[in-house]
Interface confidence: low
């Protein structure tokens, strides 16, 4: 199928990194970098499982789909894909599994048609807040990105900076409000314990959000209200115990939503009553008949849809004078 046809914009030589980062010689039309496979007809270049340590400088100008998976890139510097003339048609860039541990500010600058970016399966210990926005301005030029795949980018425990991994990722997503047009965001398998409360409100175009296989315990402070276009929300394989009324109402109010909640350790006590009532009425939960209780022990494996209010009790909290040590 066809892809973007943006005209190549000329570079200003005043850009500070261009002297070192930009390939000055235009590549020959049919040139293919060493260790890569190229198809001009498919506008595709594949440099896969080649243990490359840097992005090839001589990428053909026609490239629309670039696969640089299974390499050893380690660091993506500023302007890693800046070329003269620019790679004006590059729309899909897959860098998954390339041992990236650092993505610097402006790494994806000068890619005017970049719609889809996959950085999955890289241990990103250092993701610059300006990796996607390219500048530290409070409001950056809009990024053309509409699909950002960041599954399993959490580094091993001993390689993490002394800061919140969730915070680092969210800072990159929100910097300069550059990703306002983002439509698909995948953040699966990242050990997220929480979702910073402001992140979704600033990504209003999202259609698909994948937060599966994390460690989310609660959505109490997360608002979905602004995500009026959201079509799928993947929350499978987290540590969710219950969804409260506010969250339920917000999800129910989204016109196109499908929610996936499998494999969470639902706690079936008195706090679950609202969620069970909602589940029985709603059509937005995919596979709702598969949801089962994990706690308390007496409720384990009970199907949520089959519970009634009598099943959902909380042990009474005794006044201090009656408690035993």
């Amino acid at each position: 199928s066809s892809s973007p046809t943006s005209s190549a914009s000329s570079f200003s030589s005043s850009a500070p990194f261009l002297a070192s980062a930009v390939s000055a010689q235009p590549p020959l039309p049919d040139q293919c970098p060493a260790l890569c496979e190229c198809s001009e007809a498919a506008r595709t270049v594949k440099c896969v499982n080649r243990n490359l340590t840097e992005v090839p400088t001589d990428l053909p100008a026609y490239v629309r789909n670039l696969f640089l998976t299974g390499n050893q890139l380690a660091v993506l510097p500023a302007g890693a894909f800046a070329r003269r003339p620019p790679l004006a048609e590059l729309a899909a860039l897959n860098l998954s599994g390339s041992r990236l541990d650092e993505v610097r500010a402006g790494a994806f600058e000068h890619l005017p048609s970049l719609r889809q970016l996959d950085l999955s399966h890289n241990p990103l210990a250092d993701l610059s807040p300006f990796a996607f926005s390219g500048s530290n301005a409070s409001v950056s030029a809009p990024s053309p990105l509409v699909e950002l795949i960041l599954n399993h980018i959490v580094p091993p425990e001993d390689e993490r900076q002394n800061r919140s991994f969730e915070g680092m990722v969210v800072a990159a997503l929100l910097a300069g409000r550059a990703l306002q047009g983002l439509r698909r965001l995948e953040l699966a398998s990242n050990h997220f314990l929480y979702l910073p409360r402001d992140v979704l409100a600033q990504l209003p175009s999202l259609r698909h959000l994948d937060l599966s296989n994390n460690s989310l315990v609660s959505l109490t402070y997360v608002s979905f209200r602004n995500l009026t276009h959201l079509e799928s929300l993947h929350l499978e394989d987290n540590a969710l115990k219950v969804l409260h009324n506010g969250t339920l109402a917000e999800l129910q109010g989204l016109p196109h939503i499908r929610v996936f909640l499998d494999n969470n350790p639902w706690v079936c006590d008195c706090h679950m009553a609202d969620m069970v009532t909602w589940l029985k009425e709603t059509e937005v939960v995919q596979g709702k008949d598969r949801l089962t209780c994990a706690y308390p022990e007496k409720m384990r494996n009970r199907v949520l849809l089959e519970l009634n209010s009598a099943d959902l009790d909380c042990d009474p909290i005794l006044p201090p004078s009656l408690q035993t040590s």
């Epitope: 199928s1 066809s2 892809s3 973007p4 046809t5 943006s6 789909n65 729309a91 899909a92 897959n94 719609r115 889809q116 509409v146 699909e147 047009g181 439509r183 698909r184 259609r207 698909h208 009026t228 276009h229 079509e231 799928s232 016109p255 196109h256 499908r258 995919q286």
Partner: antibody, heavy 125, light 107 residues
Framework: QVQLVQSGGGLVQPGGSLRLSCVVS????????MSWVRQAPGKGLEWVSI???????FYADSVKGRFTISRDNSKNTLFLQMNSLRAEDTAVYYC???????????????????WGQGTLVTVSS | EIVLTQSPATLSLSPGERATLSCRAS??????LAWYQQKPGQAPRLLIY???NRATGIPARFSGSGSGTDFTLTISSLEPEDFAVYYC?????????FGQGTKVEIK
Amino acid sequence: QVQLVQSGGGLVQPGGSLRLSCVVSGFTVSSDYMSWVRQAPGKGLEWVSIIYSGGSTFYADSVKGRFTISRDNSKNTLFLQMNSLRAEDTAVYYCARDRDCHGWGSYYNRWFDPWGQGTLVTVSS
Amino acid sequence: EIVLTQSPATLSLSPGERATLSCRASQSVSSYLAWYQQKPGQAPRLLIYDASNRATGIPARFSGSGSGTDFTLTISSLEPEDFAVYYCQQRSNWPPTFGQGTKVEIK
């Protein structure tokens, strides 16, 4: 080769029912989004209904509660069940794939491509 | 819902001439706009998507431009088979909506 072949149109009285079919070849109806779009005689195009790959269905306000979109995965066929038909439902009805033009497993923006050949539904007494 | 207004309603031109069709949205649709061509008795055909990208198999004489609320479809040099009705369509906000169409006819 991708093809959408429609059938089921015809003349029906107000208040009556009709079921349109759209047989798909070249891709699987269950793995894509599918829509119905209609065109009243001499008029423009109006989106009617959509079914997502996950099974969610949505309708234009003008047909909500009267029309039902569905599919039969085993027959690779899309349906539009139209009940309580009115004169203003008279139109050529087209099925169309709601297509992501960039590929690479993305769903970020979808357009109607390709379309079925259309089938005329006339509601008149 | 977003209203798309196309102009002119009819464009009378000769083969070889340049056609410029306009589509204006009642609010911003970013670049989430497509153009379709429909010939009498036929189904519409996707020409341009995401405002400026040609669909598969569409000749280079068709081009799209614009973003936000103002969009243009240009046919650089009309061929006999290009005389048809052209519709714009947005996919930015729900529901999907179409313009009322511009008819390009032979002068």
